[in-house]
């Protein structure tokens, strides 16, 4: 019940997550830049992963895709690729651990191949939040190493005077948006593969092996109390094969390669 | 290299019109508000008229009623109508817009001033 309760809250959470990486990706709000009043109107700009976005006080809001820029810097298109590898892996993992989920049956499947999939789904989880997480820092760290503006540069063109207008680049909404969600991502997948070692089939550490003489009437059985007093898997007293080894479980079953030892 | 290059001034008679054009090129990526300032001599730089991409207008008193800004977002051009025009309006008129390259990332808006045109109000 345990390792069910763990399995689908694991897989819940981590859904939780990608949704938000997904979310935090499409998301407009990577970076702000302060509000600025211009004698026209007040303004507010803010830039994502895909577009830059442009509100006026008015309510007015217009975006524009980075299509049309001339260089994109290769740390943006990094972040870009470490969202989409989280997006996939995530959905990939998702899939994955539907059909590993304990409480949905799907033919004849074994708990075995279950607690694979749980851990390749776990597994999945874990690097899909990890790519978020890397993803949405790197893009924090070019916000703060690179893009800080503390000063206003002016210099004069052949158009005229040319000034800044902003001043600072700030984190936008998305960044916690990503690290909340690839935190989550990354919980659900630690959750999956711990929910993985409840799944699989303990094996036991030995199989108790019924021996004795042809002739005799007294078997030999090792394993303690249980096996010489006739309390393992012979409970209803059958008679051994004579000549025979056989291990506990096969007791009752078809002869094997063990009874001619 | 971005610059705005204005255009359509001159010498008007009281009471006449003029029409004043501001084509901003370079490679620009967005333009988000873009206005008109006048200096006559021995004054201060003052905003006439201003216009935001979503067409938020604002206009000095003294101009309320006789002048018009428009702009053309897909030409990245801004106009002035100025009808009965006053001797008071003569002055040198700039083009001010704020504005982003297409040179960069982030997205850094620069306030981007043209070299003006004389306007001259004049009997």
């Known amino acids: 019940m345990a390792v069910t309760a763990c399995q689908g809250l694991g897989f819940v959470v981590s859904l939780i997550g990608i949704a938000g990486i997904i979310a935090a990706t499409c998301m407009d709000q990577w970076s702000t830049q302060d509000l600025y009043n211009n004698p026209v109107t007040a303004v507010f700009n803010y830039q994502g992963l895909w577009r830059s976005c442009v509100r006026e006080s008015s309510g007015f809001t217009e975006c524009r895709g980075y299509f049309t820029l001339l260089g994109l810097p290769a740390m943006l298109q990094a972040v870009r690729a470490l969202m989409i590898v989280g997006i996939v892996l995530g959905a990939i993992g998702l899939l994955v651990s539907i059909f590993a989920l304990k409480c949905i049956r799907i033919g004849s499947m074994e708990d075995s191949a279950k607690a694979n999939m749980t851990l390749t789904s776990g597994i999945m989880f874990i690097v899909s939040g990890l790519c978020a997480i890397a993803g949405v820092s790197v893009f924090a760290n070019m916000l703060v190493t690179n893009f800080w503006m503390s000063t206003a540069n002016m210099y004069t063109g052949m158009g005229g005077m040319v000034q800044t207008v902003q001043t600072r680049y700030t984190f936008g909404a998305a960044l916690f948006v990503g690290w909340v969600a690839g935190g989550l991502t990354l919980i659900g997948g630690v959750m999956m593969c711990i929910a993985c070692r409840g799944l699989a089939p303990e094996e036991t550490n030995y199989k108790a092996v019924s021996y004795h003489a042809s002739g005799h009437s007294v078997a030999y059985k090792p394993g303690g109390f249980k096996a010489s007093t006739g309390f393992g898997s012979n409970t209803k007293n059958k008679k051994i094969y004579d000549g025979g080894a056989r291990t506990e479980d096969e007791v009752q079953s078809y002869p094997s390669k063990h009874d001619y030892v | 290299e971005v610059q705005l290059v204005e255009s359509g001034g001159g010498l008007v008679q009281p009471g006449g019109s003029l029409r004043l054009s501001c084509a901003a090129s370079g490679s620009i990526f967005s333009i988000n508000v873009m206005g008109w300032y006048r200096q006559a001599p021995g004054k201060q730089r003052e905003l006439v008229a201003g216009i935001s991409t979503g067409g938020t207008t604002r206009y000095a008193d003294s101009v309320k009623g006789r002048f018009t800004i428009s702009r053309d977002n897909a030409k990245n051009t801004l106009y002035l109508q100025m009808n009965s025009l006053r001797a008071e309006d003569t002055a040198v008129y700039y083009c001010?817009?704020?504005?982003?390259?297409?040179?960069?990332?982030?997205?850094?808006?620069?306030?981007?001033w043209g070299q003006g045109t004389l306007v001259t109000v004049s009997s």
């Open positions: 001010n817009a704020d504005l982003a390259t297409a040179t960069s990332w982030p997205v850094r808006y620069l306030e981007v």
